[in-house]
């Protein structure tokens, strides 16, 4: 006798207004009496519609929450599992049931903002900037909303960057406990003459940090050949262990690059009689603290003040 189990009921994908953080929820299946004591588990697969791969989770819950790109539609499917100890050693699963979430097609794509760029400066404040849509009327203006886990609801930008009295960016500071989690942004627009297509962005703040450049550079030469370069980590909230550095060393007309996770470096001079010995450095958040990052500007150049003559110490 084949053992069967029903799929969950009322599977749906809901948008609670958190700019891409959606709820996938369902109700338990109708279960026949002999399985009433069994634990039901649900296999949930979901993806943005343009994605090749499904994300799969198993849960005993009746809701699952995750972030999506709301520029594209979403589809999900779910089935019930009965584990083997309940079914005399055979794995039993229901048929799949499906649900989808369609994006709003209000406003043409040409009205959507272009070139959205966000940088988290020195892990302290976020600046996002954009350009207006390709074909918009002159009365069009844009509004930015953001949300991350920990906020009760989506918030609107309170400090816009403006050009010709139009919002072209936003500066956000005091983003408490906002890193290492998805940060959702929606930029929508308004015009009296046409609807404006919303634009959605999601990232994690620690991956878009642009630090300040290193400071207090110092260079010294020991034994007339050993170069020692030192610098200080820039001020601010980024822990020293989170930096990686790129150094450019210039000896007369020759330049070369080096890299380190420390804030000093030793190397040998290429030529004993070189007259010009300089370096400058930039930094970025390293792989131990983020998956990605933006290089700081280069520091000021620092040069060795010593003498290179045969009698120098």
């Amino acid at each position: 006798l084949e053992i069967k189990v029903n799929p969950p009921q009322d599977f749906e994908i809901l948008d609670p207004g958190l700019l891409g953080y959606l709820y996938l929820q369902w109700k338990p299946p109708v279960v026949i009496e002999k399985f009433k004591g069994c634990t039901l588990e649900y296999e949930l697969k979901y993806r943005n519609v343009d994605s090749d791969s499904w994300k799969t989770i198993i849960t005993r819950n009746l809701i699952y929450k995750d972030g999506f790109d709301l520029n594209k539609g979403i589809e999900g499917k779910i089935r019930t599992h009965l584990s083997e100890h309940c079914t005399n050693g055979s794995e039993v699963q229901s048929p799949w049931i499906e649900a989808s979430y369609g994006i709003s097609d209000e406003g043409s794509l040409e009205t959507k903002i272009q070139d959205m760029k966000c940088i988290y400066y020195n892990w302290q404040y976020l600046v996002c900037s954009w350009k207006p849509g390709k074909t918009v009327y002159s009365d069009t203006n844009y509004t930015m909303f953001f949300w991350y886990e920990g906020l009760d609801h989506a918030l609107q930008c309170a400090d816009y960057l403006q050009h010709d009295e139009k919002n072209v960016g936003c500066k956000l500071s005091n983003l408490d406990s906002s890193d290492y989690k998805d940060f959702f942004i929606c930029v929508n627009g308004s015009s009296k003459l046409e609807p404006i297509r919303s634009s959605y962005t999601v990232f994690q703040l620690q991956n878009i940090v642009k630090p300040l450049p290193p400071e207090f550079l110092h260079i010294s030469v020991e034994n007339s050949i050993d170069i020692r370069m030192k610098w200080s980590t820039p001020g601010g909230p980024i822990p020293p262990r989170c930096y990686t550095y790129e150094i450019v060393i210039r000896e007369d007309d020759i330049s070369w690059e080096s890299a380190t996770d420390k804030n000093d470096m030793k190397l040998k001079r290429r030529a004993n009689e070189s007259e010009d010995l300089c370096f400058f450095v930039r930094c970025k958040v390293n792989i131990y603290c983020a998956d990605d990052g933006i290089w700081s500007e280069w520091s000021e150049e620092e040069c060795w003040e010593g003498y290179t003559g045969p009698d120098s110490k």
Epitope: T59, R60, S83, G89, E91
Partner: antibody, heavy 121, light 108 residues
């Protein structure tokens, strides 16, 4: 009496491969999901991978996805973990564990004694 | 992923003391929580499953309670054999299965 006996650990260079085995006895192996849990020296427990009973659906932690492969041979009552592209951070004691009940994971009611994997040059 | 946070990290107690360890989940996990005991150089041992069910062979001085996001492991009268590290684990949703960071119970 339920017994889980791991083998296959050892010293391997970064980028190398190892295959861990876990021989199970004392229960109907195919009826239960199984898993691998590891513990780096002086650290806590970290779930690595799980596999369901007879169908063999597999699940992985992000830290090992694409590098490790869990499998089972129900005819031999054996669980495997093929570990490729090993990194220093994979150094740990690897435990094989039986799921008390559940599709691909759950509470682990029996554990092996563990096998040490050291990744170092 | 569901994060599990245990407190305290270390607990100093004496034989006969009543000991309580707390585990907090970052989202509701219903009652899908297990507690383990681990001694140095040994594999973990299941004490409690489904938040409050005592595993066979485990002394009745161990008990578990809680549901949703807050859970507690209680040892009613600490015995010399109970000095160990204790871990909670959620199995509501995976991958990944997640463990708490551990609570070391040491002699005062």
């Amino acid at each position: 009496e339920v017994q889980l006996l791991e083998s296959g650990g050892g010293l391997v260079q970064p980028g190398g491969s190892l295959r861990l085995s876990c021989a199970a006895s004392g229960f109907t192996f195919r009826k239960y999901a199984m898993g691998w849990v590891r513990q780096a020296p002086g650290k806590g427990l970290e779930w690595v991978s799980g596999i369901s009973g007879s169908v063999g659906s597999t699940y992985y932690a992000d830290s090992v996805k694409g590098r490790f492969t869990i499998s089972r041979d129900n005819s031999k009552n054996t669980l495997y973990l093929q570990m490729n592209s090993l990194r220093a951070e994979d150094t740990a004691v690897y435990y094989c564990a039986k799921v008390r009940y559940g599709w691909g994971a759950g509470a682990f009611d029996y554990w092996g004694q563990g096998t040490l994997v050291t990744v170092s040059s | 992923d569901i994060q599990m946070t245990q407190s305290p990290s270390t607990l100093s107690a004496s034989v006969g003391d009543r000991v309580t360890i707390t585990c907090r989940a970052s989202q509701s996990i219903s009652s899908w929580l297990a507690w383990y005991q681990q001694k140095p150089g040994k594999a973990p041992k299941l004490l409690i499953y489904d938040a409050s069910s005592l595993e066979s062979g485990v002394p009745s001085r161990f008990s578990g309670s809680g549901s949703g996001t807050e859970f507690t492991l209680t040892i009613s009268s600490l015995q010399p054999d109970d000095f160990a590290t204790y871990y909670c684990q959620q199995y509501d949703t995976y991958p990944p299965i997640t463990f708490g960071q551990g609570t070391k119970v040491e002699i005062k």
